[in-house]
Amino acid sequence: PSGLVTANITDSEALARWQPAIATVDSYVISYTGEKVPEITRTVSGNTVEYALTDLEPATEYTLRIFAEKGPQKSSTITAKFTTDLDSPRDLTATEVQSETALLTWRPPRASVTGYLLVYESVDGTVKEVIVGPDTTSYSLADLSPSTHYTAKIQALNGPLRSNMIQTIFTTIGLLYPFPKDCSQAMLNGDTTSGLYTIYLNGDKAEALEVFCDMTSDGGGWIVFLRRKNGRENFYQNWKAYAAGFGDRREEFWLGLDNLNKITAQGQYELRVDLRDHGETAFAVYDKFSVGDAKTRYKLKVEGYSGTAGDSMAYHNGRSFSTFDKDTDSAITNCALSYKGAFWYRNCHRVNLMGRYGDNNHSQGVNWFHWKGHEHSIQFAEMKLRPSNFRNLEGRRKRA
């Protein structure tokens, strides 16, 4: 025979074709072998011109041989080489599908691989590709869009060889709150890491506000609106600054009275204060917390104490906010001026969390009277808020 070729090569099959011998022959003897694959020999009829090779190993170079037989005579042997395709990974599945994440899992191909190419595409045409290592059989997709259909495909790689792609289709779940109005709604959307988030006041996408969410303290879901930790930020600021907010949300900052008013106007909120000093910790929770609008000079409502720090905020309940340039306290002197800070001063304070960092002079520092008195400036303080009914919302989400 002559002209031996292979066609229709896959990862496990190939078709051998040849030109018949000029003379009439009784049979053709076909043998094929690959690296680490034992030789297989088959005899076929003399009028056959093709033979399907099956059960081949993937990604393997085979040597194919054929000769003709007539009686005791044997023709010379002709040879061809071919390489089977790389077989595909199997059983690609999307599990743990959330609003912005999903887990892809697959079974490896039989052939050894040098890696995998993952491609995932949303219906809007956004395509992302990622290459993962040869020992990987799962990959977490992140930053997906909620309520979106995705097609995920995977292809095995071995040097220049690429397997066929297999695919799976999944749909991310819709966000419970597409425009979360606070950190509790962000958390109920599945975000559980503390850090910067965008919230939308009253759920209005035009009213975006970047906030720091504490997702760990007492179940999480807290908007942090004050942090003192190192004294790098100046808190002896004027009325305008306290109304608008200042500082770095990741470091020391004040979120702003206008923002506090808008947030607490959205519903019933609770306040949590976390204090830390030389390894000691204390906290205070108030189950009713609100800040009035500018017309009330941001009047404070804080009621329903529980905790370990002592009820120091009660003294400030019902008070308007004071800064050195807008004195609204009930003292003859200007409390903000006297104590170099700003707060809902009365005459003057049990709490001075916006006082002078590290100043242990009487009433001048970062004070929470019923924990450390007025002659000790506390090293770390955070004030934060979340809806009073957060526990109920959280329970509902878990049941859902």
Partner: antibody
């Protein structure tokens, strides 16, 4: 109107016990801290004990610590002072006083007082 | 404990006089100071809280001032019903303590 009425005073021998009561009306009782303040005959005012609105926190003057116990029953709008191991120096007019809203250490309403005389 | 010292212990004045009573705390108390009036056989009555805030219903002839350790109660024009004993009280820390009292009587 807001009113506090004390009762339970009387003559008692040293070492004995007495329980004072204070009935409150005209305000949301459990929103406010409550206190006992006493005044020995012809003398000034001395704070004795205080209790938070919920009853969860109690405070005492050193002179009565370990002998007196303050308590409240918010369902009955009532404040109590259990006085044990009474001494002659506990003789005084005992006033029940309401703490001011916000921080309860300013006394904005007072009862008329109940007299406790400790004598053998 | 914080000691509160009032002066004078007593004073005699006439109707229409301006009367000033001082109170000194043994340690810094910001503005955590209250003034009470007590008439014979009656319970004390809150006049001034937070050093300078007039309690509801108290006549405006009464005023308070001061912060830190030194405080003053002033009656701008003494009236017949003002003859009584006046006490200062610190509400800064427990135990809340009173001054020894200032008795204002008719000259």
């Amino acid at each position: 109107q807001v009113q506090l009425v004390e009762s339970g005073g009387g003559l008692v021998q040293p070492g004995r016990s007495l329980r004072l009561s204070c009935a409150a009306s005209g305000f949301t009782f459990d929103d406010y801290a409550m206190h006992w303040v006493r005044q020995a005959p012809g003398k000034g005012l001395e704070w004795v004990s205080g209790i938070s609105g919920s009853g969860g926190s109690t405070y005492y003057a050193d002179s009565v610590k370990g002998r007196f116990t303050i308590s409240r029953d918010n369902a009955k709008n009532s404040l109590y002072l259990q006085m044990n191991s009474l001494r002659a120096e506990d003789t005084a007019l005992y006033y029940c006083a309401k703490g001011q809203k916000g921080e309860g250490d300013t006394f904005d309403i007072w009862g008329q007082g109940t007299m406790v005389t400790v004598s053998s | 404990d914080i000691q509160m010292t009032q002066s004078p212990s007593s004073l005699s004045a006439s109707v229409g006089d301006r009367v000033t009573i001082t109170c000194r705390a043994s340690q810094y108390i910001q503005g955590f100071l209250n003034w009470y009036q007590q008439k014979p056989g009656k319970a004390p009555k809150l006049l001034i809280y937070d050093a300078s805030n007039l309690e509801t219903g108290v006549p405006s002839r009464f005023s308070g001032s001061g912060s830190g350790t030194d405080f003053t109660l002033t009656i701008s024009s003494l009236q017949p019903e003002d003859f009584a004993t006046y006490y200062c009280q610190q509400s800064y820390s427990t135990p809340q303590t009173f001054g020894q009292g200032t008795k204002v009587d008719i000259k």
